[in-house]
Interface confidence: medium
Amino acid sequence: KSPVFGPQEVSSVEGNSVSIKCYYPPTSVNRHTRKYWCRKGASGRCITLVSSEGYVSSNYAGRANLTNFPENGTFVVNIAQLSRDDSGHYKCGLGINSRGLSFDVSLEVSQGPELPNGTEVYTVDVGRTVTIKCPFKTENAPKTKALYKKIGQTSVLVIDSRNYVNPNYKDRIRLRIPGTGQLIFTVVIDRLRLSDHGLYLCQAGDGSNRDEKNADLQVLEPEPELVYEDLRGSVTFHCALGLEVANVAKFLCRVNSRETCDVVINTLGKRDSAFEGRILLNPQDKDGSFSVVITGLRKEDEGRYLCGAHSDGQLQEGWPIQAWQLFVNEESTIPRSPTVVKGVAGGSVAVLCPYNPKESQSLKYWCLWEGAQNGRCPLLVESQGLVQEQYEGRLSLLQEPGNGTFTVILNQLTTQDAGFYWCLTNGDTRWRTTVEIKIIEGEPNLKVPGNVTAVLGETLNIPCHFPCKFSSYEKYWCKWSNTGCQTLPSQDEGPSEAFVNCDENSRLVSLTLNPVTRADEGWYWCGVKQGHFYGETAAVYVAVEEKKVAGSRYVSPAKADAAPDEKVLDSGVREIENKAIQDPRLFAEEKVVADTGDQAGGSRASVDSSSSEEQGGSSK
């Protein structure tokens, strides 16, 4: 399908002008290539009428032009002095007329209505309000005022000053007679319907002295605003319906093939399941306007959208609406990234978030989509640091790999972490993306102690066991803080024979703290990565305490990675069994809040690993 997009139908009246905007993917080639507007003939050929290279056909001379806006990826064709002969089928496109990078546009030019002399024309959108002004002479001031609608040769009474209201206008029309001295009465019609379209007659008095004024009311369906967005990107519909409906329920709906409108979201709590996790209805402003954000755009999201107001929270005739025609460009600049990331309870996920690579300095954010209250998104972490304290020790936002992608790592997963998360920046809002985290059955691949109590001044060795599939990955330990995870210095011992054969005993990377200080207290992560792409992580909390007398419970300060056959040494001192390495009951129960101000560093902390080879791929 062509990525060029424009209005499908354009209608106007003889003598008027039209402006037709066409969109294209703003690639370097597209920005500079020829743009054209051509008319389709009976033979199927498309004859150029105007192009960006300065050509204007004789038929269009002096009344048409084409302007390219390469920075926006749009071009505009303006045609003036329209005649009935301009009605027909056209194409706006790029390159050669026959190449297919084009969009079909139907132009219909109709004859303007023949109106009686002195007719006032009122042009109003459906659902809005019109005020018809009706002048009269002094002698008719005390006489009956009325508004009629002309239907064929007959005139049907709509409203008069004797309190008659036509049933078709019930509860939405009023006639206002001003105070003395003002020789004008007004008729206000609210919530205009398409059927209200037509010629009206104001009348004051009767007989030959009566005052009459014709009014032509043109009720228009709102012209849809064209919206051109990239696949996987984000769109925002700003809906301004006016103060008169400020306190009425609002909705966004999508027009279906039956020309009815399916609610996408409304302020009464309804939401289409197809938009679960990727839609927010932002609260309305004091003027009654509101906005709807949709992320993770799909090709099937294309179509005509209407926003409106009605107490039922859905489309009803005669209520104000606003319209958009959404086109989703498949030649997207937004890279593919997983829309679903799976993790196991106790394990971790590493989420890749795209951003506009031109905005590398932008602030990065990650928020958790909540379905309550029309959708909202509390920030969890940003590139400046952690936002929500309940994620302490298990969430980090990394600028890597960079060049249009940042990484968010979440570990110590529970079933409550399942849900939709949004990747955001303070730059180009079209790059908002959505990822769903699913918690599946399984065991974490990296095994670390549940938590560890270290003894001040002694040596602590924390093991991290990994499976063979991570043998070629880079292994690391880092100390978590609310601004990131500081990698600890590594002592590479080089690949051993045992490691090449993925020996049982070699699948281990250990963190050594020697000697343990108060500043070492906090969260530590063991992880695997491949270059700048992060895989799984496992977290362990290290509490630091004074040396205790015999009988107190602590992990052996000399080593926390005992061999599989080691057992309880005495009533209080227990070493870690390999198969139970995740069992937190083997460690001190207390969980001390991490001091994130100081980092473990220097030669006191070291990481022992059997390999320094590069990571072979992401763990998820």
Epitope: N282, P283, K286, Y365, C367, E370, R376, Q384, W422
Partner: nanobody, 124 residues
Framework: QVQLVESGGGLVQAGGSLRLSCAAS????????MGWFRQAPGKEREFVAR????????DYADSVKGRFTISRDNAKNTVYLQMNSLKPEDTAVYYC?????????????????WGQGTQVTVSS
């Protein structure tokens, strides 16, 4: 959390105007919904106004609609409350607050960062 400091309060006659400022430090307020609350002597703290992350959506208490305007300058990391046609009943300590919600409906309970407040006194 973001640190907030209010300024611009003072004594003003009924019908007069004041502009309160709220300067944020510690981190940018871009992703935050920001709000103003007030507490009159012997009364509970009440909502005055809020503004979303982009400044495109605002909301006001009925008692201040049409008189107060909330705005923000993300580049300056500052939120403002322009108060016109002040009334004696507007006398209170005004607090600036931040809520770490990028978007969507935010209830008053969701505001987690608070300033120390600035006194506004309107004399009749």
């Amino acid at each position: 959390q973001v640190q907030l400091v209010e300024s611009g309060g003072g004594l003003v006659q009924a019908g007069g105007s004041l502009r309160l400022s709220c300067a944020a430090s510690g981190r940018t307020i871009y992703g935050y919904v920001m709000g103003w609350f007030r507490q009159a002597p012997g009364k509970e703290r009440e909502f005055v106004a809020r503004i979303d992350w982009s400044g495109s959506s605002t909301d006001y208490a009925d008692s201040v609609k049409g008189r107060f305007t909330i705005s923000r300058d993300n580049a300056k990391n500052t939120v403002y409350l322009q108060m016109n046609s002040l009334k004696p009943e507007d006398t209170a300590v005004y607090y600036c607050a931040g809520s770490a919600y990028y978007s969507g409906y935010v209830t008053h309970r969701d505001f987690g960062s608070w300033g120390q407040g600035t006194q506004v006194t309107v004399s009749s």
